[in-house]
């Protein structure tokens, strides 16, 4: 017979999730209100479009990108949506409490929803390293801890390093990657005999993962430009991100072919590498003055991504227990670092050009920011991993990793796995 959702989780998940949702509703009731001063409805719609782009990226883009497992595609998409919905609610409250609360109530604007969606995106990037090995109750814990850690990191960076919204949010790539990798490191690693086929990709799910990659590819310029201060900066960011992702697609497909002995193209490489340019230019997307520089960065990012996809999965599989097709974690960790390094290089070039000690100090501050993001990601990731290992969450048995039937009702299936 088909495998049931474990009884304990059936008791634990609805109680845990619904209690949390009730708590969030109460917090919203007592502490939030809408921005009443918006007078221009047309402007409101224009502002909403950016938030809509981010939601599409999160729900469809990252949802489908992680759905390439043969027997875990349903869970990947739906669990992503669940985490996004929960993450956005908690992120709105947390950002409000951290930045506005002394003035009384948290004012919810379209900008706060935009910010919250980006914070929730962090979880969706991280979770790629653990999807298939955890249940929904554990994912709720992961959402709460990661959104809280990212919110606090951004607040600390803003206040200590005098960093604006865009710059502190662009640490999301590095933060999410290292958070996910450290959580994965804490979870039970070995895939028992007989389950090796489950973490393999299949044609239909791989196609849906490619669909996810396409959505991300289309909307990445919106992500990189969403928090910038002025239209001039946003325009520059959109152009540069577009050039970078365009070149990284060409590089990814040709590089993937080059990396294969028979010149064949790997689906897994392409899923991930098409986004490489967008991640790499993220931090400095508004600062790059000309298309050729963005294109060079897209090329370098594409090559690094393909190289990483070729040589890192073996290591990640052994050490962290991450399946070969879940390459977002190490891909983003490499490319996020590349993006941060590019920004630091720009500051170093300033120092060389101006011979100015103050700019040298800016370089040190940027290195400090990056280090802090990595340290907080690793520490909060390890904490989350330890929490997820607690017996109360009734984690799926290793033999039931990467299996939709553990979580979903499939009436048409007569036989279990």
């Amino acid at each position: 017979m088909s495998s049931k959702y474990p009884r304990s989780v059936r008791r634990c998940l609805p109680l845990w999730a619904l209690t949390l949702e009730a708590a969030l509703i109460l917090l919203f009731y007592f502490f939030t209100h809408y921005d009443a001063s918006l007078e221009d409805q047309k402007g409101l719609v224009a502002s909403y479009q950016v938030g809509q782009d981010l939601t599409v990226m999160a729900a469809i883009g990252l949802g489908f990108l992680t759905s390439s497992f043969r027997r875990h595609s349903w869970s990947s998409v739906a669990f992503n949506l669940f985490m996004l919905a929960l993450g956005v609610q908690w992120a709105i409250l947390l950002d409000g409490f951290l930045s506005q609360f002394p003035s009384g109530k948290v004012v919810i604007t379209l900008f706060s929803i935009r910010l919250a969606t980006m914070s929730a995106l962090s979880v969706l990037i991280s979770v790629d390293a653990v999807l298939g090995k955890v249940n929904l109750a554990q994912l709720v814990v992961m959402v709460l801890v990661e959104v809280t850690a990212l919110g606090n990191l951004r607040m600390v960076i803003s206040n200590i390093f005098n960093t604006d919204y865009h710059m502190n949010m662009m640490h999301i790539y590095v933060f999410a990657a290292y958070f996910g990798l450290s959580v994965a490191w804490c979870l039970p690693k070995p895939l028992p005999e007989g389950t090796e086929d489950k973490d393999q990709t299949a044609t239909i799910p791989s196609l849906s993962a490619m669909l996810g990659a396409l959505f991300l590819w289309m909307f990445w310029p919106s992500f990189n430009s969403a928090l910038l201060r002025s239209p001039i900066e946003r325009k520059n960011a959109v152009f540069n991100t577009y050039y970078a992702v365009a070149v990284s697609v060409v590089t990814a497909i040709s590089g993937s072919s080059l990396a294969h002995p028979q010149g064949k193209i790997s689906k897994t490489y392409v899923h991930s590498a098409v986004l490489a340019g967008g991640v790499a230019v993220g931090t400095s997307c508004h600062l790059i003055p000309s298309p050729w520089l963005a294109m060079v960065l897209g090329l370098v990012a594409g090559l690094i991504s393909v190289g990483g996809a070729k040589y890192l999965p073996g290591c990640c599989n052994r050490v962290l227990g991450i399946p070969h097709s879940s390459i977002m974690g190490y891909n983003f960790s490499l490319l996020g670092l590349l993006g941060e390094i590019i920004y630091i290089v720009l500051l170093v070039l300033d120092t060389v050009g101006a011979g100015n000690g103050m700019i040298g100090f800016q370089v040190l501050l940027s290195i400090g920011e990056l280090s802090l993001a990595i340290v907080i990601a690793l520490m909060s990731g390890l904490l989350t991993g330890l929490l997820l290992n607690l017996k109360i969450w009734k984690a799926p048995h290793e033999a039931k990793y990467f299996d939709d039937q553990v979580f979903w009702k499939f009436p048409h299936l007569a036989v279990g796995f």
């Epitope: 900008f111 005098n162 201060r229 002025s230 400095s284 508004h286 600062l287 070039l349 100090f361």
Partner: antibody, heavy 129, light 109 residues
Framework: QVQLVESGGGVVQPGRSLRLSCAAS????????MHWVRQAPGKGLEWVAV????????YYADSVKGRFTISRDNSKNTLYLQMNSLRAEDTAVYYC??????????????????????WGQGTTVTVSS | EIVLTQSPATLSVSPGERATLSCRAS??????LAWYQQKPGQAPRLLIY???TRATGVPARFSGSGSGTEFSLTISSLQSEDFAVYYC???????????FGPGTKLDIK
């Protein structure tokens, strides 16, 4: 030509409210962040509030936080400042100003600078019992 | 919060002479500093942005310099219309607000 015209000033008692308006013309209003800056009699300039070009972000000086609300209507090319719980120390000439994002470039990088390049003539607010 | 200090509070200079006004920030503002001129009964006017770039229509006799915490505005040869109050202003990344200096009054000697 590019112009900002403030209105709505006047004499008001402490604790009462007043709403200032700033009508913009000669430029694409919806592409610029806008500010309110005030100047008490015989004193220097004091920044009051800013609103982003799309109205999604607002920031205030500590001295007015919780009492003043900045807003804009891009369809009417108008900026507003709603002033509640007015105090004697709010007496000043209130200017609205356009924020410009100017930039310079080297071969490898752009530098952005934020300043106020267009100012209105100001409207006087007197808070007195 | 970054505080701007301007010196001197009042500067008396003869027409045709050179005047140098100073602005100091309590912490680094990189090059995000602007200078404004305000004449009695008028609104301020932008002179310099990015510490050293002249705004449109500003005469070449006005020049700005400095970065980090020390900035100056120099008027190479004072004209009668230059006697006014000058304010420096910085933009802060976080929170994204503006701060003005207390001003320097430029008087005819």
């Amino acid at each position: 030509q590019v112009q900002l015209v403030e209105s709505g000033g006047g004499v008001v008692q402490p604790g009462r409210s007043l709403r200032l308006s700033c009508a913009a013309s000669g430029f694409t209003f919806s592409s610029y962040a806008m500010h309110w800056v005030r100047q008490a009699p015989g004193k220097g300039l004091e920044w009051v509030a800013v609103i982003s070009y799309d109205g999604s972000n607002k920031y205030y000086a500590d001295s007015v936080k919780g009492r003043f609300t900045i807003s804009r209507d891009n369809s009417k090319n108008t900026l507003y400042l709603q002033m509640n719980s007015l105090r004697a120390e709010d007496t000043a000439v209130y200017y609205c100003a356009r924020e410009s994002t100017l930039y310079s470039s080297s071969w490898y990088r752009r530098y952005y600078y934020y300043s106020m390049d267009v100012w209105g003539q100001g409207t006087t607010v007197t808070v007195s019992s | 919060e970054i505080v701007l200090t301007q010196s001197p509070a009042t500067l008396s200079v003869s027409p045709g002479e050179r005047a140098t006004l100073s602005c100091r920030a309590s912490q680094s503002v990189t090059s995000n500093l602007a200078w404004y001129q305000q004449k009695p009964g008028q609104a301020p006017r932008l002179l310099i942005y990015g510490a050293s770039t002249r705004a449109t229509g500003v005469p070449a006799r006005f020049s700005g310099s400095g970065s980090g915490t020390e900035f100056s505005l120099t008027i190479s040869s004072l004209q009668s219309e230059d006697f006014a109050v000058y304010y420096c202003q910085q933009y802060n990344n976080w929170p994204p607000i503006f701060t003005f200096g207390p001003g320097t009054k430029l008087d005819i000697k």
